[in-house]
């Protein structure tokens, strides 16, 4: 009889067991539920938000047209801001047309004045023929007004409203250009 | 994190082809651009071309022309197809994937160009 109780004893016990860990792993379950329930409603809030205050262009940028500009702060040789200008989505400046660089110089005037600013231009050591980055040429009338002396490798800046030339190795501010997002409303 | 793997490197004659692909993994969002970068004289290492998520390309002077850089959103790759390759172009190709905080490198894949 004592036999018979102390096994009824051991099967609840054993019972008891499994239903501490079910409540357990329903614990877990509903943290896990309310964690991901939390994530799923800041991850909404963040692309609400982020929709709704997304502007064509980021902070400290200046939009024009379809692109947008960064003014650097910080003076690089001219491969070093290339890389600068990557590390934000972008690349150096390509100047496209009159009216851009009229945009681009106006601006110049507006925040800093008269610098030297590097530019995706480079001249090519064996042909000596201006090329923008991406491999397209310049326009006639955005070539480099002088031609620099340096044995070195030469790359374009823009000073004033005056596009220019000089040994890559100098340490210039530099100006990066990305597209403007496009409004999806 | 970001992983990055390269592949496509290979032995091929002067006046050949060869398409590099780097495959980026992990935190991938963070990524701003990529590029491909190989040995320079003097220099640690020189950027070949780059790609933003924008789509904005730049390539060294001595590649215009004959290399192309492209993605793959989808796939998350980067490829770098070179065409009329020259014996000067042979060195490691590394791929780079640049954010605003760190840069990503990968192990390299080696391009040899016989005359």
């Known amino acids: 009889k004592l036999l018979q109780v102390s096994t009824i004893a051991m099967q609840q016990q054993e019972k008891l067991i499994q239903q501490e860990r079910a409540l357990l792993n329903f614990t877990e379950w509903k943290r896990s539920c309310a964690l991901q329930m939390k994530y799923c409603q800041a991850f909404m809030q963040n692309s609400l938000s982020s929709a709704h205050n997304s502007s064509p262009c980021p902070n400290n940028w200046i939009q024009n047209r379809e692109s947008c500009y960064y003014v650097s702060e910080i003076w690089s040789i001219w491969h070093t801001s290339q890389e600068n200008c990557l590390k934000e989505g972008s690349t150096l400046l390509q100047i496209e047309s009159k009216e851009e660089m009229d945009f681009i110089t106006g601006s110049l005037r507006k925040i800093k004045g008269s610098y030297d600013y590097w530019v995706g231009l480079s001249q090519d050591g064996h042909s000596g023929r201006w090329l923008w980055q991406d491999g397209s040429s310049p326009s006639p009338g955005l070539l480099p007004a002088e031609r620099s002396q340096s044995a070195n490798q030469v790359c374009g800046y823009v000073k004033s409203n005056s596009l220019l030339s000089s040994n890559c190795s100098t340490w210039k501010y530099f100006i990066c250009e990305k597209y403007a997002l496009r409004s999806s409303v | 994190q970001v992983q990055l793997q390269e592949s496509g490197g290979g032995l091929v004659q002067a006046g050949g082809s060869l398409r590099l692909s780097c495959a980026a993994s992990g935190s991938i969002d963070s990524i701003n651009a990529m590029g491909w970068y190989r040995p320079a004289l003097g220099e640690q290492r020189e950027l070949v071309a780059a790609i933003t998520t924008g789509g904005r390309t730049a390539y060294v002077d001595s590649v215009k022309g004959r290399f192309t850089i492209s993605r793959d959103a989808a796939k998350n790759t980067v490829y770098l197809q070179m065409n009329s390759l020259k014996p000067e172009d042979t060195a490691v190709y590394s791929c780079?994937?640049?954010?605003?905080?760190?840069?990503?490198w990968g192990q390299g894949t080696q391009v040899t160009v016989s005359s």
């Open positions: 780079k994937a640049f954010t605003r905080d760190t840069d990503y």
